[in-house]
């Protein structure tokens, strides 16, 4: 007949599940239980997933990677406290006298229960990672925590390479035995021994979970060390940077920690898995049965086959390894898991032309100078569409792209933005918001949603801002419904009158030409350059500004370039800025300077491009290291990476107005990067292409 | 009226971490730059870094591998680290803002707190 | 680095009478979208920088029209027509053109 094969990690367990095989036989549960003997945990996973083994319960690391990996999904989960259900929280906890918040643990002294623990390291440094805190480069976590925090005592990390950081706070115990030993040897060891090591001021952050702060205060605790310690005297750390009471650890934490739960193939039924195992706890759970399942103490171990701590299992419904870790955990994982020999040895990168191969080469070898890892390979292509194929087809890794071709990236390649460009504030040419610009009018103020029949203002025909952003955003929003993909028809007809200036402006509908002017002399009208004088955005403004218009689709930047005294041009010099609005897409207006809150959408910044698959951590990793060493561009490292002043080129591999690559942080798809104002516009205009 | 006030502790031992905080008043920090300037006693400016509307952060590279600007929206304040301080960065310290009104320029300035590294 | 470099260093002048600082920038300070982000600030004794001048010649609100700035690319100029007491203090331009931002050495203005 039908039988389980349980997969057993150590003799212990095998002993246990032996033990319990033959309790279950002897109830005469069915199907029967047998037992399988792997040599760890990933070592079971692999046996289930090759049909050699059935089951075995699971951590939510080894979860995620089960799942990820081999396909297979949890059924059953573990109670432990009725008050939390199939789950914990891990916390950061600080004293409340200090300043520390999420935001500035760089350099702060930190206090973990131990090595590859869920609450004291696999949950923060996998968060820190990825919420871009904390960036690792070549998998090498645990340098990369050496080198963020000012000091840690992370028992168990005496036997690595970073021993003189990791355990610098350890004190082992009072005679100074087993100094950094994960056991209680180490008296900084385990939840207490993590919060002992905040409140004893060795460190200034302490990394445990939800119930430590309050089951070691407030007269809580039997030894010496806590018994003046109070609850009110600690905050937790939020995630948005903020900090609350330490009994809001619901709202406040790093992660939702799920409970163990038994794991199967996808192919198992996981309600007969339930109710082999709901039988067996309904005997064989309390006190003075036969057999114990939630105890270990007979095998002279701990958590055997299930946490000893277990109240009960109970049934999975979602039976996804996603919906049981749920995001926060998910995205936790996902920040820690690297595992450096399944590193590949190096990031392919796409270059486009003769000068980007050259500054490729260089910049591949100042980073291998440095020892920085991935190494970089350049690989040429004919375009950056072409770069997408070929990183899609595995045959290269990575390219920067703008905001359209990350949007052909993402939605035709399935390509995932890794890293970001950051400009300072003054290039607002590579990055700004585009804006509909209006009148002050208190006696006639329209709405973004009452523009039908209005009379516009763009900067010319396919400009960014002054057609593409604003014109997909009305077809996408509904206003305006092209007919036989007839776009300009359909915008001659939604406004009154417009000025749309054209380079060819054959079969060009004359209602997008009846506001414009042309030169001093009247001629040249509507010519897609600067003899018309509402072409361009400063045109464009000016249109609104002597009235041809009623509103102006231009950059953020437009009204003031021309207002409060900064064009001296006739036209402009004596306008204000406090006389023109911004019409926001919720239907209300905002002063000219609300242009980050009120506006069409946000041209974003340029970001590098690299398939699903491919660790995004560790290419952020590469970037951050080799901006320390080569992103001034005033370095003395031998390469400038945000510089092509030396390739007779510009904005070769990345803009040269970049002053900083960026994590993605939770921006982890192309929709993210581009925002959904701007993906909308694009999907508006591109509606249209038949 | 846009207003900004630094606080913190005046003194500091050498290699410990400074750490400062810019309340603001008048104005969001979720929109506009943040920016940290210092003076040394009878000497001229220096760039510290700034923390944008979105949380991006910018540090002088002279500086980048001891400093962290951060925020605190709710408060609408934001702080500045400086870790391995030594006698040398003994300063004012300036919080100021920029915005596009003034072309980045910094328009409003906190009114300086002075941080003395000794032991 | 990018350097500023302001001269005088330390400018005697008349009450009433009029008062100029140079200052030169070790590139131009034209940026890629045609602004130029040169910037002056005044420094009272005992007191905080206070802006003076945006982007070359734009005065800032509440400054007086005695002061004024001009130039392009590399140099600029910073001139008061007359004088007051009040004007007493150091003086530092600033680009921001290029990252990082930098300021000039300072000029002090004295009354003679």
């Known amino acids: 007949g039908m039988e389980v094969r349980w997969c057993a990690t150590s003799d212990p367990e095998q002993h246990k599940c032996g033990n319990m095989s033959e309790a279950f036989r002897e109830a005469g549960i069915q199907p029967s239980l047998l037992c399988v003997r792997g040599t760890s945990a990933d070592h079971c996973v692999q046996l289930i997933a090759a049909q050699e083994a059935d089951a075995i319960t699971l951590d939510g690391g080894a979860i995620y990677e089960a799942g990820k990996e081999h396909g297979l999904k949890p059924v059953v989960g573990e109670v432990y406290d009725q008050e939390v259900g199939t789950s914990y929280y891990a916390v950061a906890v600080v004293r409340r006298s200090s300043h520390v918040t999420i935001d500035t643990l760089k350099g702060v002294k930190s206090c973990h229960t131990g090595i590859n623990r869920t609450v004291g390291w696999n949950v923060p440094v996998g968060y820190l990672v990825e919420s871009g805190r904390l960036s690792v480069m070549g998998c090498d976590v645990l340098k990369a925590v050496s080198d963020y925090f000012g000091g840690s005592c992370v028992p168990g990390a005496g036997e690595t390479s970073y021993s003189e950081s990791l355990c610098r706070l350890c004190r082992g115990d009072s005679s100074g035995e087993g100094v950094c030993d994960k056991s209680p040897l180490e008296r900084y060891y385990d939840y207490s021994g993590a919060f002992r090591c905040l409140a004893e001021g060795a460190g200034d952050v302490a990394f445990v979970k939800h119930s430590t702060v309050l089951e070691n205060t407030d007269g809580k605790t039997l030894p010496s060390w806590g018994q003046a310690l109070l609850s009110q005297d600690f905050e937790l750390l939020c995630r948005d940077g903020s900090r609350a009471d330490v009994t809001e650890w619901r709202q406040c934490h790093l992660a939702r920690v799920p409970a163990h739960a038994v794991v199967v193939r996808a192919d198992t039924d996981g309600g007969l898995i339930f109710r082999l195992l709901n039988e067996g706890q309904r005997l064989f759970s309390h006190e003075g049965s036969s057999f114990q399942m939630f105890s270990s103490e007979a095998y002279g171990q701990k958590d055997l086959l299930f946490k000893d701590s277990t109240s009960e299992l109970v049934p999975i419904a979602t039976q996804t390894y996603e919906a049981w870790l749920g995001h926060e955990y998910l995205h936790a994982m996902k920040g820690l898991l690297c595992d450096p020999n399944r590193l590949p040895p190096y990031l392919r990168w796409c270059v486009l032309s003769t000068p980007e191969i050259q500054k490729c080469g260089d910049m591949a070898v100042a980073f291998r100078r440095q020892r920085l890892k991935p190494e970089i390979q350049c690989v040429s292509a004919k375009s950056p569409q072409h770069c997408m194929e070929r990183i899609q087809a595995e045959q290269v890794d990575a390219v920067t792209l703008s905001g359209e071709d990350i949007y052909t990236a993402g939605k035709t390649y399935g390509l995932v933005p890794a890293a970001g460009e950051h400009y300072a504030p003054e290039d607002s040419s590579n990055s700004y918001y585009v804006v509909a610009v209006v009148r002050r009018d208190s006696s006639h103020a329209f709405t973004l949603d009452e523009l039908r029949g209005k009379r516009s203002c763009h900067a010319g025909f396919g400009s960014p801002a002054g057609w593409d952003v604003p014109v997909g955003a009305l077809i996408q929003r509904g206003f305006i419904r092209p007919k036989d993909c007839d776009v300009l028809t359909a915008v001659s007809e939604f406004f009154n009158a417009s000025c749309v200036p054209v380079n060819n402006p054959k079969n060009y509908p004359s209602s997008l030409c009846a506001l414009c002017v042309g030169d001093e002399q009247g001629r040249n009208k509507c010519v897609g350059n600067s003899q018309e004088r509402y072409y361009g955005y400063r045109g464009a403004f000016r249109c609104l500004v002597e009235n041809a218009g009623d509103v102006a689709f231009v950059r953020h930047t437009t009204v003031f370039d021309n207002t409060n005294g900064h064009n001296s041009e006739p036209w402009a010099a004596e306008l204000r800025s406090e006389d023109y609005e911004l019409l926001c897409p919720n239907g209300a207006r905002a002063e000219v300077s609300q242009f980050a809150a009120c506006n069409l959408a946000q041209i974003p910044p340029h970001a590098v491009m690299v398939r699903p698959d491919t660790n995004i951590f560790t290419v952020y990793g590469l970037l951050d290291k080799a901006q320390d060493l080569f992103g001034d561009d005033h370095n003395k490292n031998g390469f400038k990476m945000f510089d092509s002043s030396n390739y007779h080129g510009q904005d070769l591999l990345f803009k040269d107005a970049t002053v900083r690559a960026v994590p993605v942080g939770e921006k982890t798809t192309y929709r993210g990067w581009l925002g959904l104002d701007y993906v909308a516009a694009l999907e508006g205009m591109s509606s249209q292409q038949c | 009226q846009v207003q900004l006030q630094e606080s913190g502790p005046g003194l500091v031992k050498p290699s410990e971490t400074l750490s400062l905080t810019c309340t603001v008043s008048g104005d969001s920090i979720t929109s506009g730059y943040w920016n940290w300037i210092r003076q040394p006693p009878g000497k001229g400016l220096e760039y510290i870094g700034y923390?944008?509307?979105?949380?991006?952060?910018y540090y002088n590279p002279s500086l980048k591998s001891r400093v962290t600007i951060s925020r605190d929206t709710s408060k609408n304040q934001y702080s500045l680290k400086l870790s391995s301080v030594t006698a040398a960065d003994t300063a004012v310290y300036y919080c100021?803002?920029?915005?596009?009104?003034?072309?980045?320029?910094?328009?409003?300035w906190g009114q300086g707190t002075l941080v003395t590294v000794s032991s | 680095d990018f350097v500023m470099t302001q001269s005088p260093l330390s400018l005697p002048v008349t009450l009433g009478q009029p008062a100029s600082i140079s200052c030169r920038a070790s590139q131009s300070l034209v940026a890629s979208d045609g602004n130029t982000y040169l910037h002056w600030y005044q420094q009272r004794p005992g007191q905080s920088p206070r802006l003076l001048i945006y982007r070359v010649s734009n005065r800032f609100s509440g400054v007086p029209d005695r002061f004024s700035g001009s130039g392009s690319g590399t140099d600029f100029t910073l001139k008061i027509s007359r004088v007051e007491a009040e004007d007493v203090g150091v003086y530092y331009c600033?680009?921001?053109?290029?990252?990082?931002?930098?300021f000039g050495q300072g000029t002090k203005l004295e009354i003679k």
């Open positions: 600033s680009q921001s053109t290029h990252v990082p931002p930098t």
């Open positions: 100021a803002r920029r915005t596009l009104a003034t072309y980045y320029a910094m328009d409003y």
């Open positions: 923390i944008s509307d979105s949380g991006i952060t």
